[in-house]
């Protein structure tokens, strides 16, 4: 490849040469593909709004929970159980949370009057002991409520547990009350204020529009734009029972989806609300089901700091805001159209696949002979020949051989390793169809040469002589006219080739060989046809005519220009041409690979 390129190389354009097949079947397949692809591309463009530039939503959320609950608590005072009624308002059952979340307490366990001192642990598998050996001074178990002193003391009756330094009395390990103490939280309502922004489109809006009726309650079908939600309804939407979840607590997601079309002609930007249970309702008891946390109310009694520990069970509501805002963008449209253009090539890929499949050797040898209805597909072989040009890699070992008594050409693509080329089987390739237009370029003398007196008899004589093999002809010769090669031992086998595979008349005895290959008049015409002002001296004339004769034979017997380049001339033809156009001195060089 040249190292530098000229200016003319820059200003050029390459394009593919195509084969147009006039076929009703393939035409229908092509248009079927094109219509389907075009329909899909248009449908996707409109339905997914792929002509828009989309931007994710940026949002802020603010919530207000409303509702009052009456709680009936069972407490033990001086060994007597009492039922205490208390009213819980928003400040009692909600806790400040960060992010887009709010929490509603639904159940609780109280441990009152705790102060820091030494006391026995609450009895559990890990805290029960039979001697001091079961406790370890300074030991802090992750499940424990304090630091062990190393003593095993009586907890109650004959139960002994490890003594700890902690907030005493130790919180009891007990189940959450059933039913939940704040079961009526089901009727609480929450107002969700959600402001959203699409900075790239310079657009801001909110879920509460000025004309909204503030006394509404959200309903999926009857009031889907109302931002006030009843907690019980949220759970009903997800198929959960509020009373069941309220016992242990849980996590509920409130999803606000904004799918905004910000184009002036189709403007729409309203939220869609949906709900999703986010905690694992199937959790094993050992893996802490529900949602709970502890908090303490601290106070002083007789100058001693005390606290009331409350284990709070409740529902955390996570508000998840997501969505996109889209607006028409010419670049997005162009990019989309560009990305879909390649789909239109699917028709070509599919049709090429059919042509390649139906023209394969497998179909020709196994399917077409047995399947009569498949026979119309044979036409694909014709399409394939027109569409594809097969070329063989021009390796140094590539050679083509043509025997006059065989209809095909043999391709030999291997090293001979001392074997005569005559004996190498090679691969059969079809002989290219003759292009008779080339004959019209030959001089008129070839078409209607008057018979030269005496010559036909000589040819006849030659034919008679050629059939029996002479004593001088090599063993591989089948026509009796071949001569041994003069090349060195290593290259000799390349010239050990006859014009025939089986014994018979030599091709050099044919009328056409004389007229096409040996006619000085024709060869001179061909040389001048290439170079009209060619001046030839005697020695160079013979050399040029000899090589032109070789070429004429190769083109005549091999047809294709590519095959002719790698054609090996039979020994009989080679020596007949050399006899007609001899070299004044020195040896003949023999075949040389053109690449």
């Amino acid at each position: 490849m040249p190292a530098c390129c000229s200016c003319s190389d820059v200003f050029q354009y390459e394009t593919n040469k195509v084969t147009r097949i006039q076929s009703m079947n393939y035409g229908t397949i092509k248009w079927f593909f094109h219509v389907i692809i075009f329909s899909y591309v248009c449908f996707a463009l409109v339905s997914d709004k792929l002509y828009q530039r989309k931007e994710p939503v940026i949002s802020s959320v603010h919530t207000k929970v409303k509702g009052i609950a009456e709680v009936k608590e069972e407490i033990v005072e001086n060994g007597v159980k009492k039922l205490v009624h208390s009213v819980f308002d928003t400040a009692d059952y909600t806790f400040p949370l960060q992010g887009n979340s709010f929490f509603v307490m639904t159940n609780f366990l109280k441990t009152e009057g705790q102060e820091q001192r030494l006391c026995p642990e609450y009895p559990t598998r890990r805290t029960l002991c039979s001697s001091d050996r079961g406790c370890k001074k300074g030991w802090m178990d992750p499940q424990s409520k304090g630091i062990q002193t190393g003593r095993c003391v009586v907890y109650e009756g004959n139960q002994k547990t490890c003594e700890v330094s902690a907030w005493c009395p130790i919180e009891a390990v007990e189940e959450a009350p059933r039913p939940a103490l704040l079961n009526s939280a089901e009727n609480f309502t929450v107002l969700i204020k959600n402001n959203i922004d699409f900075p790239g489109h310079n657009y801001t809006t909110r879920n509460i529009l000025p004309g909204l009726n503030i006394t509404c309650t959200f309903h999926k079908t009857q009031n889907p734009q109302c931002p006030i939600f009843r907690l019980g309804d949220i759970f009903r939407e997800t198929g959960d029972n509020f009373s069941d979840v309220a016992i242990q607590g849980g996590i509920m997601g409130i999803e606000i989806y904004w799918d905004c079309n910000l184009d002036r002609w189709f403007h729409h930007c309203r939220p869609k609300y949906s709900f999703r249970r986010l905690d694992d309702k199937t959790t094993n008891v050992s893996l802490y089901p529900g949602y709970n946390f502890r908090y303490a109310k601290y106070y002083k009694e007789n100058n001693v700091e005390k606290r009331t520990l409350i284990k709070v069970f409740g529902i955390r509501f996570d508000i998840l805001v997501f969505g996109t805002g889209g607006k028409f963008d010419i670049i997005q449209l162009v990019v989309y159209i560009g990305s879909t253009l390649s789909y239109f090539g699917l028709a070509a890929v599919f049709i090429d696949f059919l042509i390649d499949t139906y023209s394969s050797n497998c179909c020709r040898s196994h399917i077409y002979p047995w399947c009569k209805c498949c026979q119309p597909c044979v036409v694909n072989e014709y399409y394939y020949r027109k569409k594809c040009e097969s070329i063989v890699e021009p390796k140094p070992t590539l050679k083509y051989v043509s025997f006059v008594d065989e209809s095909h050409i043999r391709m030999v693509n291997q090293q001979l390793l001392g074997r005569s080329l005559q004996d190498v089987k090679g691969q059969e390739v079809p002989r290219p169809a003759m292009d008779f237009t080339d004959l019209s370029r030959l001089p008129l003398a070839l078409h209607d040469t008057p018979p030269i007196p005496g010559q036909p008899e000589e040819i006849q004589l030659l034919r008679k002589e050629a059939t029996p093999r002479s004593r001088d002809s090599p063993v591989w010769c089948q026509c009796g006219s071949c001569l041994p090669s003069q090349l060195p031992e290593s290259h000799r086998c390349l010239e050990e080739l006859c014009c025939r595979k089986k014994p018979g008349a030599c091709i050099t005895t044919s009328e056409l060989f004389r007229k096409l290959v040996l006619s000085r008049h024709v060869l001179q015409f061909l040389l001048l046809y290439q170079e009209p002002l060619l001046a030839l001296d005697v020695d160079s004339t013979n050399s040029r005519l000899r090589h032109c004769a070789y070429r004429c034979y190769a083109t005549w017997r091999f047809g294709s220009q590519d095959m002719a380049d790698f054609a090996i001339l039979p020994s009989c033809c080679r020596w007949r041409i050399r006899k007609e156009f001899p070299k004044s001195e020195g040896q003949y060089s023999g075949f040389k690979s053109p690449y």
């Epitope: 598998r125 890990r126 029960l128 002991c129 039979s130 050996r133 079961g134 406790c135 370890k136 030991w139 178990d141 992750p142 499940q143 050992s286």
Partner: nanobody, 129 residues
Framework: EVQLVESGGGVVQPGGSLRLSCAAS????????MGWFRQAPGKEREFVAA???????DYGDSVKGRFTISRDDAKNTVPLQMNSLKPEDTAVYYC???????????????????????WGQGTLVKVSS
């Protein structure tokens, strides 16, 4: 849930040896601390030996140096090799299992019977001449 079956009990002369074996059912055997306890007639259940799921062992004061506990997680068994047996070793020997899935049992707690959730039916060992 783990089922425990003790075997290997019997009558043996003082100074003799005996090998008890505890076979456990359940795929999660390797997550359990295993212990041997014994109860002589009219006495409290007493700790003999224990091995945690990660292989640390603990022995009762009266059997230290004479008894050896080991575990074979492939076969789900916990053998107790008892050598130099004395008449006071006569008792019903129980195999016990403590779940360590959610946290290891501290070494100083391995001898506490309260740590063990699952118990076998027991096998009798009698040491007499």
């Amino acid at each position: 849930e783990v089922q425990l079956v003790e075997s290997g009990g019997g009558v043996v002369q003082p100074g003799g040896s005996l090998r008890l074996s505890c076979a456990a059912s359940g795929r999660t055997f390797r997550h359990y601390a295993m212990g041997w306890f014994r109860q002589a007639p009219g006495k409290e259940r007493e700790f003999v030996a224990a091995i945690s799921s990660y292989g640390s062992t603990d022995y009762g004061d009266s059997v230290k140096g004479r008894f050896t506990i080991s575990r074979d997680d492939a076969k789900n068994t916990v053998p107790l090799q008892m050598n130099s047996l004395k008449p006071e070793d006569t008792a019903v020997y129980y195999c016990a299992a403590a779940d360590e899935t959610l946290g290891a049992v501290p070494n100083f707690r391995l001898h506490e019977k309260y740590e063990y959730e699952y118990w076998g039916q027991g096998t009798l060992v009698k040491v007499s001449s």
